[in-house]
Interface confidence: low
């Protein structure tokens, strides 16, 4: 059940990023650290960089509330997995500040790309029975 809960939360994050991409014009056009081509075993570290980034609503128009709620949900901690627990202790991963900074559109695209990667890794780790909840 923990596996499924993790999968549903990760899936929701993908959907939220997809939905926020439709509102990039309502986000503060600030440059944010956006990990790309993340090396294996540093996915959770990069994920936390995306979560820590100060993505903000520009406070314009009717979309402000839904954007703020969505950003909050992006920062919600997904259920822990063995892979996540293992990676939390890696000190060799790049710091958040070392990643290239990008505007919200590219930031969200890279976040989505990382989520997709983590998603597929999670599925394949289940298939090969190497991870439990």
């Amino acid at each position: 059940q923990g596996q499924d809960r993790h999968m549903i939360r990760m899936r929701q994050l993908i959907d939220i990023v997809d939905q926020l991409k439709n509102y990039v014009n309502d986000l503060v056009p600030e440059f944010l650290p956006a990990p790309e081509d993340v090396e294996t075993n540093c996915e959770w570290s990069a994920f936390s960089c995306f979560q820590k980034a100060q993505l903000k609503s520009a406070n314009t128009g009717n979309n402000e509330r839904i954007i703020n709620v969505s950003i909050k949900k992006l920062k919600r901690k997904p259920p822990s997995t063995n892979a996540g627990r293992r990676q939390k202790h890696r000190l060799t991963c790049p710091s958040c500040d070392s990643y290239e900074k990008k505007p919200p559109k590219e930031f969200l695209e890279r976040f989505k790309s990382l989520l997709d990667k983590m998603d597929h890794q999670h599925l394949s780790s289940r298939t090969h029975g190497s991870e439990d909840s």
């Epitope: 059940q1 994050l13 959907d15 997809d18 939905q19 439709n22 969505s70």
Partner: antibody
Framework: EVQLVESGGGLVKPGGSLRLSCAAS????????MNWVRQAPGKGLEWVSS????????HYADSVKGRFTISRDNAKNSLYLQMNSLRAEDTAVYYC?????????????WGQGTTVTVSS | AIQLTQSPSSLSASVGDRVTITCRAS??????LAWYQQKPGKAPKILIH???SLESGVPSRFSGSGSGTDFTLTISSLQPEDFATYYC?????????FGQGTKLEIK
Amino acid sequence: EVQLVESGGGLVKPGGSLRLSCAASGFIFSSYSMNWVRQAPGKGLEWVSSITSGSYYIHYADSVKGRFTISRDNAKNSLYLQMNSLRAEDTAVYYCVRERGWGYYGMDVWGQGTTVTVSS
Amino acid sequence: AIQLTQSPSSLSASVGDRVTITCRASQDIDSALAWYQQKPGKAPKILIHDASSLESGVPSRFSGSGSGTDFTLTISSLQPEDFATYYCQQFNSYPYTFGQGTKLEIK
């Protein structure tokens, strides 16, 4: 107006096939997970299958696994359910349903349903 | 699969009554639950998402509460249009499952 319109239901013999379609309008279809839910005559609701916005996750109820295939075409704002090896117990109204999105739990937009009858 | 058990299965009440329907999950589902209303010949309509959040456009007489395994849907003062069947649904794990339904009838 946010709308889902199902089509493709009908009468089919046991062992036969049908393809249900759902046309979405009034919202950004490519950003939402979609589901099929069915209801047999006089019975409760049964979740059948779900597919995420980019088709990354696909899940089925055990009762239809291996026989039904869910798919979507985001360019056409359409959701599909290919139903093979149909059985009498698949007789139901099939609803196309949008998952609420934005990280919320719920299904907030339902089509009017299309009726599938499996009978010899 | 997670089982949802609704009680009662049917209920007779009068306009103005306060009504409570419960939904019990076979395991912890956090707040991953929604409530729906369905009238004969119509598609279901969402009332509550995330166990306790009222869906936009739904009258405030409807409310949801609970977390973990025990959930309730409350209608504070029944209106004639509230006589229908109510379902809970969990989103904690696949397969998504529904409760068996509670039919609310006029006394």
